[in-house]
C-alpha cells in the first residue's frame, strides 16, 4: 500500500499536516499523480548529488508528460490543464536549482512518515491515556455547550413565531370590538364587557410572551458569552500554546476543524439573534406600551450581541501556519533574507457571506517600539504580494483562509548606520508579522488583526542553528505571543521544561527522543553532577558560554550531532541503537561486567562537528580491572566516505603478530554485532571475474574499500580519558610513550 | 461612566496646524470606530473623519481630505486629529464621538474642542 | 455620496403640540439612520438610531419611523425641554456618513 493511500485514511486532524507540507512551489497535485513513482526514488540521494537530482528533475518532467497523455486519452481537460501548470511551475522553480526540489521532495516525504508514525502512536495512547480522556470530555463539554446555545436560538425562533401570532391575533381582536363599538346597532354593555375583559387578558398575554422572549435572549446572550469566553480564553488559548509547541517539535498540535465548528455555530447564532431583534422590533413598531419590555431591553440586546460578534469575529482571525521557509519545514519562524517563506491565516467563523470578502494585508514589525527602542534593531522589507483574500476554494478542507507562499524579507540598509552595534545579536532580535483585515457590511464595519509567533531574521544559512535557539528559548518559555524584547533580559529555563524541549529536536527529526539516561546526561553537562528537574539554566550556557573547557555551546554541539544522525546516522538512532549521551563514568559502569567485546555508540564530546566513536572492553592485560578503549571519533568527513555499520562491520585493531582482529563483538548489552547492524551493512559488489579487472564500465581499476585500523593495539593506551582528541599536554604525553611515528600511523584510522 | 475628552483646541493662523485629542474611558476604546464631527458657528453637524477600531481604515470628508491625518493609540485610549494647512472654513468646534452596534450610531459624544483659524 | 435633505428647516410648535420632522436620502439607506437632538452650546445627544430604535433613556414620547429612503422624528407632545436643533444621520455607508442640515424647533 502507498504511504499516499495511507495518509488519505488518516483522521482529519492528522490530515491537515499533510496538507501543510504542500504549497505552490511542490504542489500536492504532482504528490497525488505521481505518488507511487515519488515514493520509489531515492530522493536522499537526489538531494546531495546535483546530477543525479538533474536526472530525477527531467524524469519527473517526463513522468508529468505521461500523466498528461492519460488525461489527454480520458478527454480530462481542467487534470491536462493543471498538469501543464504544474509542469510549468515545477520548470520556472526548479530547472536552475534541481537539488531545491529533492530536497523538498525528500523533506515531504519524511514528514509524511513521520505523520503517519504519530497517527499511529496517537491511536495507541488513545485506547489507554489519561490525558486523552480528559481532552475528550472537555469536548464533550463544549459540544454540549454551543449546541445549547443553537437550541436556545431555535427556541426563541419559535417563541418569537407565537409572540407574532398572538399579537396578530390580540390586534385583531381590538379592531374588532373597536368597528363593532362603532356599529350604530352597538353590542349588548355585558357582551362588551366580556370581550374587554378577554382583550384584557390576552394583553396580559401578550406583555407575558414579550416578557418572556426578552428573558429569553438575556439567558441566551449569558449563555452564549459563558460558551464563546471559553472557545476564545481557554479552548483557542491552548490550541495556540500548543501550536507553539508543535513548532519548536513538540506533538502535532490539534486541527483546527473542530474549533472552526463551534466558532462558526456560535456566530450563526448570533447573526439570527440580529435577525430574532430586528423582528421583535417590528413587533414593538406595531403595538406598543408603557413598561414595553421591548422598549425597556431592546437596546441592552443589541449592544451585547453586536460586542458579542464583534469580540467572536476578532478573535477568530488566526494564524493557522507559522511562517516557515518551505526548505527548512522543521524550523519555522527563522526566516532567511531573500529566500521564500509560506504563511497561513485562518478565519474560525466560516461564514459563506465572508467568501471572498476579506482581503488581508501581511506586515512586517507593525507597531513594534523595538525599532525605535533597540539600538541597531534592523529593519525590514517584505517582497512579495502583500495582500490575499480569504476563500473556501484554496484551502483542501474548505476552511477560510489565505496562504501567503512567496513572501520573502530584504533588509533595509541604513546608509552609514553599522546594524551589529546593538545590545542583541541578529539571532536574537525578535520580529513580527502582522496581518490585517476588515469585515465590512451593511450594519458591520470590523478590523481583524493578528500576529505570527515571534521570527528571527537570518541572513546566511550558518545562523540557522543560533536562529532555531532563540526560537527554542522563547516558545518553551513565553505564553503569550508578543514580547519582542525578550532576549535584553532571558529567563533561565528549568531543566524539565529544557529537558522535554531537547527531547522533542531528536524526536521532532527522526522516530526517537532521547531518554531518560541520556537527559540525565546532558543535564549534568549544563548544570553539573546535581542536575535536577527544577536546576535553572541560563540562556548563555544553552547557547552561548562554552560547555566545560571545550571552545563551542551545548546547543551547538547538540545541533551538530543532530545534522550528524540526520545525515549519516538515522537508522542506527532510529533502532536504538546509538547510546549517544552518556558520560564517561556511566559507560564503564555499564561496560565493565560485560563479556569482552561488548562496546556501545556514543557521541563525542569533544568535537565541535558532530562525531559518534565506539568504546568497548576488554579483558586487561594484568587480570584487575577491565580495559576500555574508545576509536577516535568519526565526523561527517568519515562517515561521507564509509557508512558507520560498514565501519562497525570491518574496524580492526592490530593484535599480537600484527594479525589485524575486529574487536567488536556484541552491541550493549549483548546484541550480536552482525544481527544489530547486518541489515544496514552494504551489499557485497558482485566479485567480477578474474579476467574482468575493468569491470563492466571498463575503468581499469580494482574496487577498493575503505576501513578503520588501528594500528597500534589500544590496550596500550589504557583508558578511554587518553583517546583522541586531546588537549595539547595530553598529546605531548602520549607521543613520548608510543613514539612519534607509531603515533601519526595510529591517527590515521581511515 | 463613558467619557469623552477633547483637548488641544485653539487659535491659529491660516496655513498653520493643529493637533486634536480626544481622551476616552469607560468603555472597551479598541472596539469601536471613531469619529471627529465638526460644527461652524451657527452651522450644522459636518463629518469630517472616522477611523475603524484597529486603525486599519480611514476616512475623511472632501473638505479635509489630503490635510487632516486622524489616528488612534489604542493602548493610550486616545484618538487623535492632526490639522494642517489649516483655512479660515475650519474655524468650528470640533466634537469626537464614539461609533457603535450595528447601526454605527454615534451614542456618546465629547464636550466639544474649539478651533479658531483667523489671522 | 449619499445626500440627507431634511424638512422643514425650521418650525414653531406650542408645548403639547405633535410635531413631525422629515429626512429623506438621495438614495435607499434601509434603516441606517440615526436622528440627534443639539441644545445651544451643548454635545449632540443620541435620540434614535435604526430608523424607529429609541435610544435608552430617551421618552417615549419621541418616536422614528419609516425606511429605505423617507424617514420621520415624532415628538407626539411637545414638552419645554425639547425646543433644540435636530439632525438625522445616515451610517449606510457610514465612511462617509452623512448629516442632514438639521431642523431648528422653536417655541411657539
Known amino acids: 500500500m502507498s504511504q499516499w493511500y495511507e495518509l488519505q485514511q488518516l483522521d482529519s486532524k492528522f490530515l491537515e499536516q499533510v496538507h501543510q507540507l504542500y504549497d505552490d512551489s511542490f504542489p500536492m497535485e504532482i504528490r497525488q499523480y505521481l505518488a507511487q513513482w515519488l515514493e520509489k526514488q531515492d530522493w536522499e540521494h537526489a538531494a546531495n548529488d546535483v546530477s543525479f537530482a538533474t536526472i530525477r528533475f527531467h524524469d519527473l518532467l517526463s513522468q508529468l508528460d505521461d500523466q498528461y497523455s492519460r488525461f489527454s486519452l480520458e478527454n480530462n481537460f481542467l487534470l491536462q490543464h493543471n498538469i501543464r501548470k504544474s509542469k510549468r511551475n515545477l520548470q520556472d522553480n526548479f530547472q536552475e536549482d534541481p537539488i531545491q526540489m529533492s530536497m523538498i521532495i525528500y523533506s515531504c516525504l519524511k514528514e509524511e512518515r513521520k505523520i503517519l508514525e504519530n497517527a499511529q502512536r496517537f491511536n495507541q495512547a488513545q485506547s489507554g491515556n489519561i490525558q486523552s480522556t480528559v481532552m475528550l470530555d472537555k469536548q464533550k463539554e463544549l459540544d454540549s455547550k454551543v449546541r445549547n446555545v443553537k437550541d436556545k436560538v431555535m427556541c426563541i425562533e419559535h417563541e418569537i413565531k407565537s409572540l407574532e401570532d398572538l399579537q396578530d391575533e390580540y390586534d385583531f381582536k381590538c379592531k374588532t370590538l373597536q368597528n363593532r363599538e362603532h356599529e350604530t346597532n352597538g353590542v349588548a354593555k355585558s357582551d362588551q364587557k366580556q370581550e374587554q375583559l378577554l382583550l384584557k387578558k390576552m394583553y396580559l398575554m401578550l406583555d407575558n410572551k414579550r416578557k418572556e422572549v426578552v428573558h429569553k435572549i438575556i439567558e441566551l446572550l449569558n449563555v452564549t458569552e459563558l460558551t464563546q469566553n471559553a472557545l476564545i480564553n481557554d479552548e483557542l488559548v491552548e490550541w495556540k500554546r500548543r501550536q507553539q509547541s508543535a513548532c519548536i517539535g513538540g506533538p502535532p498540535n490539534a486541527c483546527l476543524d473542530q474549533l472552526q465548528n463551534w466558532f462558526t455555530i456560535v456566530a450563526e447564532s448570533l447573526q439570527q439573534v440580529r435577525q430574532q431583534l430586528k423582528k421583535l422590533e417590528e413587533l414593538e413598531q406595531k403595538y406598543t406600551y408603557e413598561h414595553d419590555p421591548i422598549t425597556k431591553n431592546k437596546q441592552v440586546l443589541w449592544d451585547r450581541t453586536f460586542s458579542l460578534f464583534q469580540q467572536l469575529i476578532q478573535s477568530s482571525f488566526v494564524v493557522e501556519r507559522q511562517p516557515c521557509m518551505p526548505t527548512h519545514p522543521q524550523r519555522p519562524l527563522v526566516l532567511k533574507t531573500g529566500v521564500q517563506f509560506t504563511v497561513k491565516l485562518r478565519l474560525l467563523v466560516k461564514l459563506q457571506e465572508l467568501n471572498y470578502n476579506l482581503k488581508v494585508k501581511v506586515l512586517f514589525d507593525k507597531d513594534v517600539n523595538e525599532r525605535n527602542t533597540v539600538k541597531g534593531f534592523r529593519k525590514f522589507n517584505i517582497l512579495g504580494t502583500h495582500t490575499k483574500v480569504m476563500n473556501m476554494e484554496e484551502s483542501t478542507n474548505g476552511s477560510l483562509a489565505a496562504e501567503f507562499r512567496h513572501l520573502q524579507l530584504k533588509e533595509q540598509k541604513n546608509a552609514g548606520t553599522r546594524t551589529n552595534e546593538g545590545p542583541l545579536i541578529v539571532t536574537e532580535e525578535l520580529h513580527s508579522l502582522s496581518f490585517e483585515t476588515q469585515l465590512c457590511q451593511p450594519g458591520l464595519v470590523i478590523d481583524l488583526e493578528t500576529t505570527s509567533l515571534p521570527v528571527v531574521v537570518i541572513s546566511n544559512v550558518s545562523q540557522l542553528p543560533s536562529g532555531w535557539a532563540s526560537i527554542l528559548w522563547y516558545n518553551m518559555l513565553v505564553a503569550e505571543p508578543r514580547n519582542l524584547s525578550f532576549f535584553l533580559t532571558p529567563p533561565c529555563a528549568r531543566w524539565a521544561q529544557l529537558s522535554e524541549v531537547l527531547s522533542w529536536q531528536f524526536s521532532s527529526v527522526t522516530k526517537r527522543g532521547l531518554n531518560v539516561d541520556q537527559l540525565n546526561m546532558l543535564g549534568e553537562k549544563l548544570l553539573g553532577p546535581n542536575a535536577s528537574p527544577d536546576g535553572l539554566i541560563p540562556w548563555t550556557r544553552f547557547c552561548k558560554e562554552n560547555i566545560n573547557d571545550k571552545n563551542f555551546p551545548f546547543w551547538l554541539w547538540i545541533e551538530s550531532i543532530l545534522e550528524l544522525i540526520k545525515k549519516h546516522l538515522l537508522p542506527l538512532w532510529n533502532d536504538g541503537c546509538i547510546m549517544g549521551f552518556i558520560s564517561k563514568e556511566r559507560e564503564r559502569a555499564l561496560l565493565k561486567d560485560q563479556q569482552p567485546g561488548t562496546f556501545l555508540l556514543r557521541f563525542s564530546e569533544s568535537s565541535r562537528e558532530g562525531a559518534i566513536t565506539f568504546t568497548w572492553v576488554e579483558r586487561s592485560q594484568n587480570g584487575g580491572e577491565p580495559d576500555f578503549h574508545a576509536v577516535e571519533p568519526y565526523t561527517k568527513k568519515e562517515l561521507s566516505a564509509v557508512t558507520f555499520p560498514d565501519i562497525i562491520r570491518n574496524y580492526k585493531v592490530m593484535a599480537a603478530e600484527n594479525i589485524p582482529e575486529n574487536p567488536l563483538k556484541y552491541l550493549y548489552p549483548n546484541i550480536d554485532k552482525d544481527h544489530a547492524f547486518g541489515k544496514y551493512y552494504s551489499r557485497p559488489k558482485e566479485a567480477p571475474e578474474p579476467m574482468e579487472l575493468d569491470g563492466p564500465k571498463g575503468t581499469g581499476y580494482i574496487k577498493t574499500e575503505l576501513i578503520s585500523v588501528s594500528e597500534v593495539h589500544p590496550s596500550r593506551l589504557q583508558t578511554t580519558d587518553n583517546l583522541l582528541p586531546m588537549s595539547p599536554e595530553e598529546f605531548d604525553e602520549v607521543s613520548r610513550i608510543v613514539g612519534s611515528v607509531e603515533f601519526d600511523s595510529m591517527m590515521n584510522t581511515v | 461612566e463613558v467619557q469623552l475628552l477633547e483637548s488641544g483646541g485653539g487659535l491659529v493662523q491660516p496655513g498653520g496646524s493643529l493637533r486634536l485629542s480626544c481622551a476616552a474611558s469607560?468603555?472597551?476604546?479598541?472596539?469601536?470606530?471613531m469619529y471627529w464631527v465638526r460644527q461652524a458657528p451657527g452651522k450644522g453637524l459636518e463629518w469630517v473623519s472616522s477611523?475603524?477600531?484597529?486603525?486599519?481604515?480611514?476616512y475623511y470628508a472632501d473638505s479635509v481630505k489630503g490635510r487632516f491625518t486622524i489616528s488612534r493609540d489604542n493602548s493610550k485610549n486616545t484618538l487623535y486629529l492632526q490639522m494642517n494647512s489649516l483655512r479660515a472654513e475650519d474655524t468650528a468646534v470640533y466634537y469626537c464621538?464614539?461609533?457603535?452596534?450595528?447601526?454605527?450610531?454615534?451614542?456618546?459624544w465629547g464636550q466639544g474642542t474649539l478651533v479658531t483659524v483667523s489671522s | 455620496d449619499i445626500q440627507m435633505t431634511q424638512s422643514p428647516s425650521s418650525l414653531s410648535a406650542s408645548v403639547g403640540d405633535r410635531v413631525t420632522i422629515t429626512c429623506r436620502a438621495s438614495?435607499?439607506?434601509?434603516?441606517?439612520l440615526n436622528w440627534y437632538q443639539q441644545k445651544p452650546g451643548k454635545a449632540p445627544k443620541l435620540l434614535i438610531y435604526?430608523?424607529?430604535s429609541l435610544q435608552s433613556g430617551v421618552p417615549s414620547r419621541f418616536s422614528g419611523s419609516g425606511s429605505g429612503t423617507d424617514f420621520t422624528l415624532t415628538i407626539s407632545s411637545l414638552q419645554p425641554e425639547d425646543f433644540a436643533t435636530y439632525y438625522c444621520?445616515?451610517?449606510?455607508?457610514?465612511?462617509?456618513?452623512?448629516f442632514g442640515q438639521g431642523t431648528k424647533l422653536e417655541i411657539k
Open positions: 435604526a430608523a424607529s
Open positions: 444621520q445616515q451610517t449606510w455607508h457610514p465612511y462617509p456618513s452623512t
Open positions: 438614495q435607499s439607506i434601509s434603516s441606517y
Open positions: 464621538a464614539r461609533s457603535w452596534g450595528y447601526y454605527h450610531y454615534l451614542d456618546y
Open positions: 469607560g468603555f472597551t476604546f479598541s472596539y469601536s470606530s
Open positions: 477611523i475603524s477600531s484597529y486603525g486599519h481604515s480611514t
